[in-house]
Amino acid sequence: LPAQVAFTPYAPEPGGTCRLREYYDQTAQMCCSKCPPGQHAKVFCTKTSDTVCDSCEDSTYTQLWNWVPECLSCGSRCSSDQVETQACTREQNRICTCRPGWYCALSKQEGCRLCAQLRKCRPGFGVARPGTETSDVVCKPCAPGTFSNTTSSTDICRPHQICHVVAIPGNASMDAVCTSTSPTRSMAPGAVHLPQPVSTRSQHTQPTPAPSTAPGTSFLLPVGPSPPAEGSTGD
């Protein structure tokens, strides 16, 4: 004969566990129903009555089946330097991402606590490692035979043009100037053309999801924490 189906609340078998979407209530010593996402436990179960669930209030949410007495507060509104990629609903937290040209400078958990402007490499320096969602641009001095004449968070060092007759030799921040005969481009050492968009190893070993859950407090100030300060603006 099939085992009789137990309805919550019920006492579990000795050493047994409660079923999916149920929890063991220590006070009642019974298996009781969890509340679905978007709701919370308004009244806890007793030996004779099951959990009473209620909807989350505005600006609060629960994402999982639960028996919490209060829903979680959604994170603070996204700052002007962030973009809201997921609204706060009864079932999910607000998600903010750093706007283009910025990266997440501080995220110890899934939320981004601090967005920072991507470092710009000054003339004579090019991008050695592009910025990612969670790491800043790394600048490097342009190698001999290459130059960068821009202040940019994306430009790499480019090779000097090869002149039949040089009018002005190139340096790290300026291209060579040729006399009127048509120049050619060298592929000098260190002149690596990175395809756009660039995908390189970032400063973390596992991919971080692009969105970040809005934390309780969101600070947004320009920062440039990567060690190679030379070649960057803002010093």
Partner: antibody
Framework: QSVEESGGRLVTPGTPLILTCTVS????????MGWFRQAPGEGLEWIGS?????ITYYANWAEGRFTISRTSTTVDLEITSPTTEDTATYFC??????????????WGPGTLVTVSS | AGDMTQTPASVEVAVGGTVTIKCQAS??????LAWYQQKPGQPPKLLIY???KLASGVPSRFSGSGSGTEFTLTISDLECADAATYYC????????FGGGTEVVVK
């Protein structure tokens, strides 16, 4: 609650070395951890930090030279190809927790690594 | 040691006196800064976090202030036990330490 580093010893350049940070009374699923070093007579230097979700941040200079990994009770630091410049006392630190700044309030006594031919 | 400039490198102060140590970040890090004390042969000890919050068990003689790029650690009513090296640390993903300040108590 305590943190203790081990595995420090004299190694020749290029010989990989794994340092182990063993924690007791700490649930590593709730705390981020960091590795640091201090050369004799020098200041503190951050190597890398591992979040509770496994994402690891490295100092730019340390990227590719060090690897941080974790078990339920240990956080390991591998020095992939040590050079004499890697001679230092290596510290493991436990982060304060939460989602704020990276701060470390529980440290091990350190383990000395000497790289010499 | 990251983009953190710490001054002075060394300071000598009499018992009961006050010492002020400054730390400058190359660009704004908001309030995400900590101060540590380290004595010879020992690991660092967290004193202050979020620029001004006192860590557990740290006496109120220690205080921190600042935000953005300029930060200060002040130790008042100096005691012999305060002789140590003090470090600032930026608390963002790319952690960096200042070069340290040796405090000598006369």
């Amino acid at each position: 609650q305590s943190v203790e580093e081990s595995g420090g010893r004299l190694v020749t350049p290029g010989t990989p070395l794994i340092l182990t940070c063993t924690v007791s009374g700490i649930d590593l699923s709730n705390y981020a951890m960091g590795w640091f070093r201090q050369a004799p007579g020098e200041g503190l230097e951050w190597i890398g930090s591992r979040r509770t979700d496994g994402i690891t941040y490295y100092a730019n200079w340390a990227e590719g030279r060090f690897t941080i990994s974790r078990t339920s009770t240990t956080v390991d630091l591998e020095i992939t190809s040590p050079t004499t410049e890697d001679t230092a006392t290596y510290f493991c630190g436990r982060d304060v927790g939460g989602d704020g700044g990276w701060y470390f309030n529980l440290w091990g006594p350190g383990t000395l690594v000497t790289v010499s031919s | 040691a990251g983009d953190m400039t710490q001054t002075p490198a060394s300071v000598e102060v009499a018992v009961g006196g006050t010492v002020t140590i400054k730390c400058q970040a190359s660009q704004s890090i908001n309030i995400y800064l900590a101060w540590y004390q380290q004595k010879p042969g020992q690991p660092p000890k967290l004193l202050i976090y979020d620029a001004s919050k006192l860590a557990s068990g740290v006496p109120s003689r220690f205080s921190g202030s600042g935000s953005g790029t300029e930060f200060t650690l002040t130790i008042s009513d100096l005691e012999c036990a305060d002789a140590a090296t003090y470090y600032c640390q930026q608390g963002i993903n790319n952690i960096g330490f200042g070069g340290g300040t040796e405090v000598v108590v006369k």
